[in-house]
């Protein structure tokens, strides 16, 4: 921000009324009036260029310092070219000297040179040559000097002429302030510029109404430079929840809008399924039946639990069931739907029922499923199973009601045995099998059916209570189709896959290959 100038003395604006002191009296400096741009202007002028040893002083009136620490002196003046005088005026000069003196009181007409300290020699950038003078072109020079730190109540300036032809048209003395400033929602007070050029005065800012320093942020500070400019902003204020930045202020969110945190962001429109918010809202309440999960951003619409899975099927495959379902028709407005599968088994004879989570096996963990199918195995034959698939989302935990669909299935067969070839020879095949332990108690025998591949007219059957059998009297180097099936009191269980096993050829009869 531009520095603010506080003027302590302005000769040009005073219209010749200041009455400065000249020394020696009646010689040297003289108050003149001239016409420029059809306006009367006043100037202090001296032009004793033909006489040597000039020492003419012009002293200002006493200037009250006030709060100024460093003053700036702006001079507007014109200096005539020494060559514009006949014979060159050998004693003529083209500079003058600027002095100051501090004091706690006004000495009036008591002028003492020794009290004055030289600030600088003032030289023009442009001198007024003869042609400019004749044409009344005033070559105005502007020079600025500064003095500080000042400590007394007031001061004088003085101008010493040593034989120049000079006119002072303007003497302006001012000090600089960093103006009151609103930046980053912080208000910085008007501050007097310091007196030492390298130093910057640190000034703390105050957050505007309804603005705060963000958590973990720095307090707002700026630095007031010697020239009255604000520099190096540090920290900031942000509008508090329920308020947004409008130009340099924090304004309450309009009805129907909200802002839930201290941030730079504007107020947002209340999302779907929320009630209209009042002015200055930090959040928007959910409509009846709609909810917001703890992790949901406030900008997200309110949502509700999903409806039940749309369609559920249970397809039995021996002692396995594949459960398939479709997503709920109403997701509740959320995408974080998961499914939970629970299982209940009932004994047909007694009608007694109980949970079966511990006795069955799921193809993947049954809670928090994201896919819409799961396979349940290790089911006991001749048992009734009821499967419940519940759809849940991020807000399901906020209500007591559940959204689920059930499917029941009766297991009438054992699971198909898993068959392995344990060994073979040119005339025999050793075969073993297994079924899940929960089903073994219901099996009283296993039936092994085998035949030559390609011979669909005849087959052989062997029954055993064990889990293995050796099939003898087989033809060498021949492929046999083998299937194992469990037999229960209620009938046949599910048959295994049909396996192809080949006997050895006569050349390799010495070894038993597995």
């Amino acid at each position: 921000a531009q520095g603010k100038e506080v003027v302590l003395l302005d000769f040009a604006a005073a219209g010749g009324e200041l009455g400065w002191l000249t020394h020696p009296y009646g010689k040297g400096w003289d108050l003149m009036q001239n016409i420029m741009n059809d306006m009367p202007i006043y100037m202090y002028s001296v032009c004793n260029v033909m006489s040597g040893d000039q020492d003419n002083w012009l002293r200002t009136n006493w200037v009250y310092r006030g709060e100024a620490e460093r003053i700036f002196i702006e001079l507007k003046f014109t200096v005539r070219d020494c060559n514009s005088f006949p014979g060159g005026a050998s004693s003529c000069k083209e500079t003058f000297n600027l002095y100051y003196a501090e004091s706690d009181l006004d000495y009036g007409t008591n002028f003492q040179k020794r009290l004055f300290t030289k600030i600088d020699t003032i030289a023009p950038d442009e001198i007024t040559v003869s042609s400019d003078f004749e044409a009344r072109h005033v070559k105005l020079n502007v020079e600025e000097r500064s003095v500080g730190p000042l400590t007394r109540k007031g001061f004088y300036l003085a101008f010493q002429d040593i034989g120049a032809c000079v006119a002072l048209l303007s003497v302006r003395v001012y000090y600089k302030k960093c103006p009151e400033l609103l930046q980053s929602l912080a208000r910085f007070p008007e501050t007097i510029a310091g007196s030492d050029a390298p130093s910057l005065a640190t000034v703390a800012g105050t957050c505007v109404d309804h603005a705060v320093v963000p958590p973990g942020g720095e307090e707002p500070r700026m630095h007031c430079a010697v020239d009255g400019e604000w520099l190096v902003p540090i920290g900031q204020c942000l509008c508090q929840a329920g308020y947004e930045k409008v130009e340099d202020a924090c304004q309450a969110c309009s009805p129907g809008f909200f802002k839930f945190e201290v941030s730079e962001s504007p107020c947002l429109e209340c999302p779907e399924h929320t009630l209209p918010s009042p002015e200055g809202a930090t959040s928007c309440e959910c409509e009846e039946g709609f909810f917001r999960a703890p992790q949901d951003p406030m900008s997200m619409p309110c949502t509700r639990p999903p409806s039940a899975p749309h369609y559920l099927t249970a397809v039995g495959m021996g002692a396995k069931v594949e459960l398939r379902w479709t997503p709920p028709q109403d997701s509740g407005g959320r995408e974080d739907i998961v499914y939970s599968v629970t299982c209940e088994q009932c004994w047909p004879e007694s009608g007694e029922c109980g949970p079966c989570e511990s006795s069955v096996r799921y193809s993947e963990p049954p809670h928090g499923l994201t896919r819409t199918s799961v396979t349940v195995s290790d089911l006991e034959p001749h048992m009734n199973y009821t499967f419940t698939v519940e759809a849940r989302n991020g807000v399901s935990g906020l209500v007591t009601s559940r959204s689920f669909r059930t499917a029941s299935v009766s297991i009438n067969q054992t699971e198909p045995p898993k068959v392995r070839l344990e060994g073979r020879s040119t005339t025999s095949l050793s075969v073993s099998w297994s079924i899940p332990p929960p089903q073994q108690s219901r099996v009283w025998k296993y039936e092994v059916t085998y035949r030559k591949k390609g011979d669909s007219n005849s087959y052989n059957v062997r029954r055993t209570e064990g889990f293995s059998v050796t099939l003898d009297d087989l033809a060498p180097d021949t492929t046999y189709l083998v299937q194992v099936q469990a037999l229960t009191q209620e009938g046949q269980g599910a048959g295994s896959k049909v396996h192809e096993f080949q006997t050895l050829s006569p050349e390799g009869s010495g070894s038993l290959a597995v």
Epitope: Q33, N34, I35, S45, C47, S84, S130, E134
Partner: antibody, heavy 128, light 107 residues
């Protein structure tokens, strides 16, 4: 020594014309502002016109504006006053006068000029 | 235009007298005032410029003072050569008007 010598005066009828000349010597003519000042018989001085060192700007008294023309020829060190539509009240001794800013010991020139050097004058009589 | 009024219009004085002539401007002219001396049948001669500055070659018995609207020319110790008519002239405006003159005669 600065010398200004006017010529061209004489008797002329009302409505007639006359051209006055002023020959300058003893100084750098092209540095000087030049002017014509007249004095009616037994009366005071009246400024008539001025011309800048290099031929401009020119100014005229209201009483002669539009009738008189001031000019100069710096190569000939001569100042002129062309007087047309002459009237009886133009009867006067016409002085040529000069001003050199070098001799004006002020930092800022006055709004107009005063006259440091004068010629001896030439009489113009307008009469029928 | 600015009017310049001189007083008195004439005065009688003796050699050695101190004589003062005044000139009043109809509006402020700061110090932009010149004084001239004219003898019968001769051209005027510059005495003083900028109200108080003595022109080169002018005797120091002549002095000028004043600013704004009131000005004076003083001859301190009148000499026989000083009997003449004196004119003031303002050069604060382009019209450059003269006073009507003050005739200084021998008593």
């Amino acid at each position: 020594e600065v010398q200004l010598l006017e010529s061209g005066g004489g008797l002329v009828q009302p409505g007639g014309s006359l051209r006055l000349s002023c020959a300058a010597s003893g100084f750098t003519f092209s540095h000087y502002m030049m002017a014509w000042v007249r004095q009616a018989p037994g009366k005071g001085l009246e400024w008539v016109s001025r011309i800048g060192p290099s031929g401009g700007p020119t100014h005229y008294a209201d009483s002669v504006k539009g009738r008189f023309t001031i000019s100069r020829d710096n190569s000939k060190n001569t100042l002129y006053l062309q007087m047309n539509s002459l009237r009886a009240e133009d009867t006067a001794v016409y002085y040529c006068a000069g001003y050199d800013s070098g001799y004006d010991y002020v930092a800022v020139a006055g709004p107009a000029e005063y006259f440091q050097h004068w010629g001896q004058g030439t009489l113009v009589t307008v009469s029928s | 235009d600015i009017q310049m009024t001189q007083s008195p219009s004439s005065l009688s004085a003796s050699v050695g007298d101190r004589v003062t002539i005044t000139c009043r401007a109809s509006q402020s002219i700061s110090t932009w005032l010149a004084w001239y001396q004219q003898k019968p049948g001769k051209a005027p001669k510059l005495l003083i410029y900028k109200a108080s500055n003595l022109h080169t070659g002018v005797p120091s018995r002549f002095s000028g003072s004043g600013s704004g609207t009131e000005f004076s020319l003083t001859i301190s110790g009148l000499q026989p050569d000083d009997f003449a008519t004196y004119y003031c002239q303002q050069y604060n405006q382009y019209s450059r008007t003269f006073g009507q003159g003050t005739k200084v005669e021998i008593k």
